[in-house]
């Protein structure tokens, strides 16, 4: 025996209260596949979420984050505040990277400048809060096992970032 509900297309549900008639999904609900016995509630894009695609009877709404926030998680399930390059997000807000660290993204955390001297190179371009140092050619007089004559940049060990 074929299940009568299998004939109900997407956008409808099999209504047990009405002799398994295919009824349209009520407002603010959807069914993306046929044969459903209930319709799912549409996702609401509220607060820091904004609507990227409206809900229809056959597909859920899609959200993204309002300007100043970025998506995390499947289907943009979370929004996290952006900062500027050269900053990192703490509970007290966006804080500048400490000296010797940088962040070239609007999200994430600061990380230490590369220590050019570890590879026997010199600093060609100094680092900033937004950019890593650029390492240049090998330091004069460098050979493996000897230290660089260039004053080393801060080692790539994390410093204490501001809270």
């Amino acid at each position: 025996l074929q299940d009568p509900c299998s004939n109900c297309p997407a956008g409808t549900f099999c209504d047990n209260n009405r002799n398994q008639i295919c009824s349209p999904c009520p407002p603010n609900s959807f069914s993306s596949a046929g044969g459903q016995r209930t319709c799912d509630i549409c996702r609401q894009c509220k607060g820091v979420f904004r609507t990227r695609k409206e809900c229809s009877s056959t597909s859920n709404a899609e959200c993204d984050c309002t300007p100043g926030f970025h998506c995390l998680g499947a289907g943009c399930s979370m929004c996290e505040q952006d900062c500027k390059q050269g900053q990192e997000l703490t509970k007290k807000g966006c804080k500048d990277c400490c000296f010797g660290t940088f962040n070239d993204q609007k999200r994430g955390i600061c990380r230490p400048w590369t220590n050019c001297s570890l590879d026997g190179k010199s600093v060609l371009v100094n680092g900033t809060k937004e950019r890593d140092v650029v390492c240049g050619p090998a330091s004069a007089g460098f050979s493996p096992g000897t230290s660089s004559v260039t004053p080393p940049a801060p080692a790539r060990e994390p410093g204490h970032s501001p809270q």
């Epitope: 995390l72 998680g73 499947a74 399930s77 979370m78 996290e80 703490t90 509970k91 993204q105 994430g108 955390i109 990380r111 230490p112 590369t114 890593d132 790539r156 994390p158 204490h160 970032s161 501001p162 809270q163």
Partner: antibody, heavy 116, light 108 residues
Framework: QVQLVQSGAEVKKPGESLKISCKGS????????ISWVRQMPGKGLEWMGK????????NYSPSFQGQVTISADKSISTAYLQWSSLKASDTAMYYC?????????WGQGTLVTVSS | DIELTQPPSVSVAPGQTARISCSGD??????AHWYQQKPGQAPVVVIY???NRPSGIPERFSGSNSGNTATLTISGTQAEDEADYYC???????????FGGGTKLTVL
């Protein structure tokens, strides 16, 4: 869609070396931190360390510093966790996860069994 | 590094409120996040940044964080909420993430 796919289960003997992998897809792999998390049988989650694949900068939990090595190859969007000499106490499920504070995507886990 | 302490187990009757605590020195100065893990599965975020709920997580999940304690609250607990729950925080001192020991929630 974003996915982290880990290499398969491993059975090893004490003293052997091992390198497990975590391949990211569906996002800019180079610009998101990847963390590794250990879960010993019947126990809780332990954060081991993280890597920024863009420049391979790593940072370890003090408990795991010197015990494991985390690396990445951004050209193939893959992060690695490796041991030079396994111990029986390394038997655990190992997860990779995207992020450094909020872990929004997780791999399926790699079960590592170390037994003589 | 900060240490996060959770009760090993919490039991609750269906429909009642479950509260899971996570204590650590001045955890309120950092963001706390909460993960749910069911047997054989990877963890899933249920609360992030102290009190924010990802879409797809039921409204009965809520969080708070101040002083030395972060709390995950599940109002009207359902059988499907039975799982292990872990708090975590990222500390800028040491640049590390720490997980609590985990709490097994049993729905009676």
């Amino acid at each position: 869609q974003v996915q982290l796919v880990q290499s398969g289960a491993e059975v090893k003997k004490p003293g052997e070396s091992l390198k497990i992998s975590c391949k990211g897809s569906g996002y800019s792999f180079s610009t998101y931190w990847i963390s590794w998390v250990r879960q010993m049988p019947g126990k809780g989650l332990e954060w081991m360390g993280k890597i920024y694949p863009g420049d391979s900068y790593t940072n370890y939990s003090p408990s795991f510093q010197g015990q494991v090595t985390i690396s990445a190859d951004k050209s193939i969007s893959t992060a690695y966790l490796q041991w030079s000499s396994l111990k029986a106490s390394d038997t655990a499920m190992y997860y990779c996860a995207r992020g450094y504070g909020i872990f929004d995507y997780w791999g399926q886990g790699t079960l590592v069994t170390v037994s003589s | 590094d900060i240490e996060l302490t959770q009760p090993p187990s919490v039991s609750v009757a269906p429909g009642q409120t479950a509260r899971i605590s996570c204590s650590g020195d001045n955890i309120g100065d950092q963001y706390a996040h909460w993960y749910q893990q069911k047997p054989g599965q990877a963890p899933v975020v249920v609360i992030y940044q102290d009190k924010n709920r990802p879409s797809g997580i039921p409204e009965r999940f809520s969080g708070s964080n101040s002083g030395n304690t972060a709390t995950l609250t599940i109002s009207g607990t359902q059988a499907e909420d039975e799982a292990d729950y872990y708090c975590s925080t990222y500390t800028f001192v040491g640049f590390t993430t720490v997980f609590g020991g985990g709490t097994k929630l049993t729905v009676l």
